[in-house]
């Protein structure tokens, strides 16, 4: 199930997925002056089985000598409703694929790719927040957001992060200072079904990752 909205926006912060759940889709977008090749992939799709996940399709861009068109009018069987967008950041540091079953790594850049990426996330996806350069993180709780399904609708949990305008960049994830005692998640879950997946795995994985996964510019 696709998430109906983007992850929450936090002033002076960016978010990043450490890995992408199966079903996630990434638009094949090209920078100005370029277009997808004829009959080229419209998007990449994270697919896999119990032992291995990878991105199906490859995005390819070519010069826009003619207008940006792609001929393909028959929906493919694997096409499914999807959703999400994120500002494009540098591909993350490599993650051991075995550490996060059912997830794909950040796709490598393709030639003449657009300067931002638009992802379409699925329920259970977790993203992590970091203050932009020049801002410092104050925490009330986890600096992360999870797409959950409640009462048949999707929503993102609210990350407990405030970025203050002090000229100091924080480490990520965890270890920001000053940091108040975590209060736990602010959402009070009701008695209806809540669908969450992989939270513990992703949190543990995040805690062991290098902190330099964000960059301010995409090369």
């Amino acid at each position: 199930e696709l998430c109906d909205d983007d992850p929450p926006e936090i002033p002076h912060a960016t978010f990043k997925a450490m890995a992408y759940k199966e079903g996630t889709m990434l638009n094949c977008e090209c920078k100005r002056g370029f277009r997808r090749i004829k009959s080229g992939s419209l998007y990449m799709l994270c697919t896999g089985n119990s032992s291995h996940s990878s991105w199906d399709n490859q995005c390819q861009c070519t010069s826009s000598a003619t207008r940006n068109t792609t001929k393909q009018v028959t929906p493919q069987p694997e096409e499914q409703k999807e959703r999400k967008t994120t500002e494009m950041q540098s591909p993350m540091q490599p993650v051991d694929q075995a550490s996060l079953p059912g997830h794909c790594r950040e796709p490598p850049p393709w030639e003449n790719e657009a300067t931002e990426r638009i992802y379409h996330f699925v329920v259970g996806q977790m993203v992590y927040y970091q203050c932009v350069q020049g801002y410092r993180a104050l925490h009330r709780g986890p600096a992360e957001s999870v797409c959950k399904m409640t009462h048949g609708k999707t929503r993102w949990t609210q990350p407990q992060l405030i970025c203050t305008g002090e000229m100091e960049t924080s480490q990520f994830p965890g270890e920001e200072k000053p940091q108040a005692s975590p209060e736990g998640r602010p959402e009070s879950e009701t008695s209806c079904l809540v669908t969450t997946t992989d939270f513990q795995i992703q949190t543990e994985m995040a805690a062991t990752m290098e902190t330099s996964i964000f960059t301010t510019e995409y090369q």
Epitope: L42, R67, Q72, K81, I118
Partner: nanobody, 123 residues
């Protein structure tokens, strides 16, 4: 509440041009495609063109040489420039919004529809 409102339809002569517009409101459409479909009397609704937030486009074979889709993100509008119109282009033209990347979504699966605008091309 999402609303899609089409405008620009009308009666034109074969060979003429027409520009349809659709104003979208009620949510952020950054990760939605905006698209145009049409439905002629007695026929199924037909995909024409779609465009993403970053201007990636997709056209149906039947119109790709004559129709051009464009998008104005700050105004949440999408346009369909239709040139060299033919009598067989006569139909009700619908604006649509759908989650996900540019792709030819089958009409029953589209998330949001406008009410449609009539285009009639006389010979």
């Amino acid at each position: 509440q999402v609303q899609l409102v089409e405008s620009g339809g009308g009666l034109v002569q074969a060979g003429d041009s027409l520009r349809l517009s659709c104003a979208a409101s009620g949510r952020s459409f950054r990760n939605y495609i905006l698209a145009w479909y049409r439905q002629a009397p007695g026929k199924e609704r037909e995909f024409l063109a779609a465009i993403s937030w970053l201007d990636g486009t997709l056209y149906a074979d039947s119109v790709e040489d004559r129709f051009t889709i464009s998008r104005d993100n700050p105004k949440n509008t999408v346009h369909l420039q239709m040139d060299s119109l033919k009598p067989e282009d006569t139909a009700v033209y619908y604006c649509a919004a759908d989650r996900g990347p540019v792709r030819p979504v089958l009409a029953p699966d589209v998330d949001y529809w406008g009410q449609g605008t009539q285009v009639t091309v006389s010979s």
